[in-house]
């Protein structure tokens, strides 16, 4: 009671940022933690389809928004053909797995690469194949497949017909290919994310423009879309649920990103109110909905109330709990450019240890896999990248740090990326694999960085030794 | 700077309409709801309603609903606001309000326009 | 719909003097409350949002509290420049609502 009237949000995460030490969940005095995460813990790897398989045209692929929005919308970009190739070059990726020694690699499947309209009628064989072989390969690998159904690259033909994520009859359309992937790859398949980072969807996409489909300043469209796919993942959560899990017995969840940020001043309720404000735009906006109440945080709800869709009673039941596990995203496209509306004059932070004490106190203490995490280097860099090993160290150490002092329940760790590739308004100006890939070369080696070195052995080790 | 210049004073007869401009200036005009505000003589001030300038979306308080349409021309960033049926009551002074999303309040506001409804 | 009261209706002080008023919603409203300063023939200006936040390039005499039903809105140093009206506003639910008013002058 006491803390809806002081902050007007619902859960307990403005603790963090107070510097009682009896009250704040997080103990500074250990900056750096050697030791090893739990046993079995999952440590692995993830891609994008449009940042590194290429082939944006070739064997029946439809065009995606991102494929037209790189023609249209970014400057010196020809198109993603020049990336990694990894649906030419499948070998190089699974060698390039077999080096670091991961548990899983995370992946997303391209729509348009399947079903080249996006209507789910015969799938496309040449797309169908590639995700089959890669799937068979993992498997025997012994690498776990987490696959992602969505990340950015809608069929175009479902923008031009329907407006795309606008218009609510994309839900049933996404449901259906949904469900064709779940009969094809579930027998394969444990780890589904449904959506990746869909703030980035929509705020980039409808708000700021920065990303496909390139619509800039309309709000009501920005949470419209965001209503769109909190709704089209919770249909397919509920689908999952009942028809494929009971034989698959597998897991699905959607991936939220988020920044973190700190007060100006520590002691300053109202600036504290504002990082709590800060959090609940961002991350609230989708977890609340899936990993709460079922219904939008109180703030936004008061605030946005012009442009905020509302749920119905129904809805709050339906989309409430439909998350196996709270799958988190923590890297640069929730840093740079980060929402002006976000950031509430404070200061915006790295501290990822903190952020997943946020996740603990404000939606009960939910098991967690970072699905994302890493950071960039110039794109001059070649394979000597000691500011990613540097940025990963740091925060490996935090996660570690959460498991280990603050008892917090993360059972995997998602290095970005597997590959250089295409990335997204930065294009191919920034990298952020592990493994090198020179986008000028007809094979498109995979030469492993530094990096990859050094995430090998912390996976060697389960962490970090003495 | 964030401007919001409104029309001038107009005296209307009971029964008549009246429409009042907003001209808004030093920000995307598109990007804000205009919400539009009364203050009758001698009277607190009362909230009429919004409208989103982008996709001219509208939401009006219960009193007005029906006598109030709110619009907007994107080409000349100007807000608009009419109101039909005039009677004596209606005689205030209407102001536009520019909403900011992050605050939950009306950050700019115009110089307000005297509406008279007198016969 | 959410009745906002506020008391002083009006006040007069001197200069220098603190000046409080309050604001009372006829229900819970959290910490949906904004302030604002009206003078004759001018905009009105937004001084405080979210009960305590003072708006940018608002002098820093000017301060808010409170949280529920409950609220105060404080001048610390009453100046010549502050004579006006000033209002508090609800946004926790449609209708928005503003409080009466309070007339500050100098005596």
């Known amino acids: 009671i006491l803390l809806r009237a002081v902050t007007g949000f619902s859960g307990d995460g403005r603790a963090i940022w107070s510097k009682n030490p009896n009250f704040t969940p997080v103990n500074e005095s250990q900056l750096f933690l050697y030791d090893t995460f739990p046993k079995n813990f999952f440590w692995g790897i993830g891609t994008g389809a449009l940042q590194v398989e290429g082939s944006w045209k070739k064997d029946g692929k439809g065009p995606s928004i991102w494929d037209h929005f790189i023609h249209t919308h970014l400057k010196n970009v020809s198109s993603t053909n020049g990336s990694s190739d990894s649906y030419i070059f499948l070998e190089k990726d699974l060698s390039a797995l077999d080096f670091i020694g991961v548990s899983f690699y995370q992946f997303s499947i391209s729509w348009p690469r399947l079903f080249p309209d996006g209507i789910v009628t015969v799938a496309n064989a040449k797309g169908l194949q590639y995700y089959s072989t890669l799937l068979d390969a993992l498997v025997l690998r012994n690498i776990e497949p987490i696959v992602t159904l969505y990340h950015w690259d809608l069929p175009l033909a479902l923008q031009e017909k329907y407006g795309g994520w606008k218009n609510d009859t994309i839900i049933d359309i996404f449901n259906d290919y949904a469900t064709y992937c779940f009969q094809m790859f579930g027998d394969r398949v444990k780890y589904w994310i449904t959506i990746h980072n869909p703030y980035l969807v929509a705020w980039h996409g409808y708000g700021t423009g920065m990303h496909a489909p390139g619509e800039k300043g309309n709000l009501a469209a920005v949470y419209t879309v965001g209503h769109n796919l909190i709704k089209a993942h919770s249909k397919v959560w509920h689908n999952y649920n009942t028809h494929f899990r009971p034989h698959q017995k597998g897991w699905l969840s959607i991936t939220l990103g988020s920044h973190w940020i700190e007060p100006n001043r520590s002691e300053n309720t109202m600036d504290i109110f504002k990082c709590q404000q800060s959090m609940v735009s961002v991350l609230g906006w989708f977890a609340n909905p899936i990993h709460g109440d079922g219904d939008y945080p109180e703030g936004m709800r008061k605030k946005l109330f012009s442009v905020l869709p509302i749920f119905s009673e129904a809805e709050k039941h339906e989309m409430r709990g439909t998350a196996d596990f709270f799958a988190f995203s923590f890297g640069p496209n929730n840093f740079k450019p980060l929402n002006t509306m976000a950031k509430m004059g404070q200061n915006v932070s790295l501290n990822l240890r903190e952020a997943l004490n946020w996740i603990k106190l404000e939606y009960n203490n939910p098991r967690i896999l970072i699905a994302e995490n890493g950071w960039f280097t110039d794109s001059r860099v070649k394979t000597e990248d000691t500011t990613a090993i540097y940025m990963m160290k740091n925060f490996l150490s935090q996660v570690l740090q959460a498991i280990r002092l603050d008892e917090i329940r993360v059972f995997g760790y998602t290095a970005w990326s597997l590959l250089d590739g295409f990335e997204w308004q930065d294009a191919y100006t920034i990298r952020r694999g592990l493994f090198y890939v020179d986008f000028n070369s007809k094979q498109k080696e995979r030469k492993p960085k530094s990096s990859a070195h050094y995430y090998k052995q912390i996976i060697r080790e389960n962490g970090f030794s003495l | 700077q964030v401007q919001l210049v409104q029309s001038g004073a107009e005296v209307k007869k009971p029964g008549a309409s009246v429409k009042v401009s907003c001209k808004a200036s030093g920000y995307t005009f598109t990007s804000y709801d205009i919400n539009w505000v009364r203050q009758a003589t001698g009277q607190g001030l009362e909230w009429m309603g919004w409208m989103n300038p982008h996709s001219g979306n509208t939401g009006y308080a219960q009193k007005f609903q029906g006598r109030v349409t709110m619009t907007r021309d994107t080409s000349i960033n100007t807000a608009y606001m009419e109101l039909s049926s005039l009677r004596s009551e209606d005689t205030a002074v209407y102001y536009c309000?520019?909403?900011?999303?992050?605050?939950?309040?009306?950050?700019?506001w115009g110089q307000g326009t005297m509406v008279t409804v007198s016969s | 719909d959410i009745q906002m009261a506020q008391s002083p209706s009006s006040l007069s002080a001197s200069v220098g003097d603190r000046v409080t008023i309050t604001c009372q919603a006829s229900q819970d409203i959290s910490i949906y409350l904004n302030w604002y300063q009206l003078k004759p023939g001018k905009a009105p200006k937004l001084l405080i949002y979210?009960?305590?936040n003072l708006e940018t390039g608002v002098p820093s005499r000017f301060s808010g509290g409170g949280s529920g039903t409950d609220f105060t809105f404080t001048i610390s140093s009453l100046q010549p420049e502050d004579v006006a009206t000033y209002y508090c506003q609800q946004y926790d639910n449609l209708p928005l609502t503003f409080g009466p008013g309070t007339k500050v002058d100098i005596k």
């Open positions: 979210d009960v305590s």
């Open positions: 309000a520019k909403y900011n999303w992050n605050y939950g309040a009306f950050d700019f």
